[in-house]
């Protein structure tokens, strides 16, 4: 799998989409996991509803939400109030039994807020009670890593 880069602005919401073949993955729940190192496991962050017929219902874990259009074949993950520590490598997965197929490998990059030099009084800061439904979603900038680019930079 190539790795697709999604860029979002710190403090805003980032939407990651993972298209898939709806027939091939029919009846399968999906998950979003965070890659722990190049060879490490992918740690589950959030998964779709435990009844596949209700996969379109938004499920969330902390600031991350997931919803699945099983007929259209698009898994959507929303990272709300994006923070620098959210940057990293992730996977969209299709689950079957104890196995998981990778739908897409994702690199999330967090950009500095271009407004952060302004006086805090000029900034609108979303409240803790803001729901995912109300969250403003920045159109994410995405691209695939170029051939030769290293997904995991070598550690010194």
């Amino acid at each position: 799998h190539n790795t697709t880069v999604f860029q979002g602005v710190e403090g805003q919401s980032l939407q990651v989409s993972c298209p898939y073949d709806s027939m091939k993955h029919w009846g399968r729940r999906k998950a979003w996991c965070r890659q722990l190192g190049e060879k490490g496991p992918c740690q589950r962050v959030v998964s779709t509803h435990n009844l596949w017929l209700l996969s379109f219902l938004r499920r969330r874990n902390g600031s991350t939400a997931i919803t699945d259009d099983t007929l259209g074949g698009t898994l959507t993950i929303t990272l709300r109030n994006l923070q620098p520590h959210d940057a990293g490598f992730y996977q969209c997965q299709s689950l079957h039994g104890s196995e998981a197929d990778t739908l897409r490998k994702v690199l999330v990059e967090v950009l500095a807020d271009p407004l952060d030099h302004r006086d805090a009084g000029d900034l609108w800061v979303p409240g803790e009670s803001e729901s995912f439904e109300d969250a403003h979603v920045e159109h994410s900038i995405s691209r695939s890593l170029l051939e030769g680019e290293i997904p995991f930079p070598p550690t010194s």
């Epitope: 009846g27 509803h49 435990n50 017929l53 209700l54 379109f56 219902l57 259009d69 007929l71």
Partner: antibody, heavy 126, light 106 residues
Framework: EVQLVESGGGLVQPGRSLRLSCTAS????????MSWFRQAPGKGLEWVGF??????????EYTASVKGRFTISRDGSKSIAYLQMNSLKTEDTAVYYC?????????????????WGQGTMVTVSS | DIQMTQSPSSLSASVGDRVTITCQAS??????LNWYQQKPGKAPKLLIY???NLETGVPSRFSGSGSGTDFTFTISSLQPEDIATYYC????????FGGGTKVEIK
Amino acid sequence: EVQLVESGGGLVQPGRSLRLSCTASGFTFDDHAMSWFRQAPGKGLEWVGFIGSKAYGGTTEYTASVKGRFTISRDGSKSIAYLQMNSLKTEDTAVYYCARGKRYSYTYWTPAFDVWGQGTMVTVSS
Amino acid sequence: DIQMTQSPSSLSASVGDRVTITCQASQDITNYLNWYQQKPGKAPKLLIYDASNLETGVPSRFSGSGSGTDFTFTISSLQPEDIATYYCQQYDSYLTFGGGTKVEIK
């Protein structure tokens, strides 16, 4: 008039099978998920399982206690949903209801059930 | 599985009284909750869906509120025809019902 009518209930011995039917009228049957519920005498409501609308190709989901024993199916040409119950146990004794899932759009529905049948009694006893 | 704790299990109130029933989920269920009314010998009837939306044709004296783990169902002015058992139902994880609240007239 939108309505659901269940049939097929009765007295059956443990280990035997029974098939319940739910006949729909007054609405486009293929557009809705259909669910089965049950209520043991003097007890609360329990979800048994449901089947997706035609768009979902007859995909089914079940509660753990009936998985592998009960099968839900649907016949769009007759507007009937079925509950095939095999290997029945005494604890399956209940009034069985079929119900229609509330529809938002082609893709989306909510498991709020806005039309219910009158129920049919199933007694499992030797 | 998510447990739904409904309280009280029964209550007696006078016609015109405000009646409140609560439902508590064992974990956060967002707003994935419905309320039903069941009269003796009859099938359940959907009153409220998605925690706070009034089903078409249901009198406005019925209302629902809440999100997360705590939900409330209210009858603003109890009527004789409201004698029934009321159930909450969650669908955040599988589908489960509360134990029911039997409402009687004093």
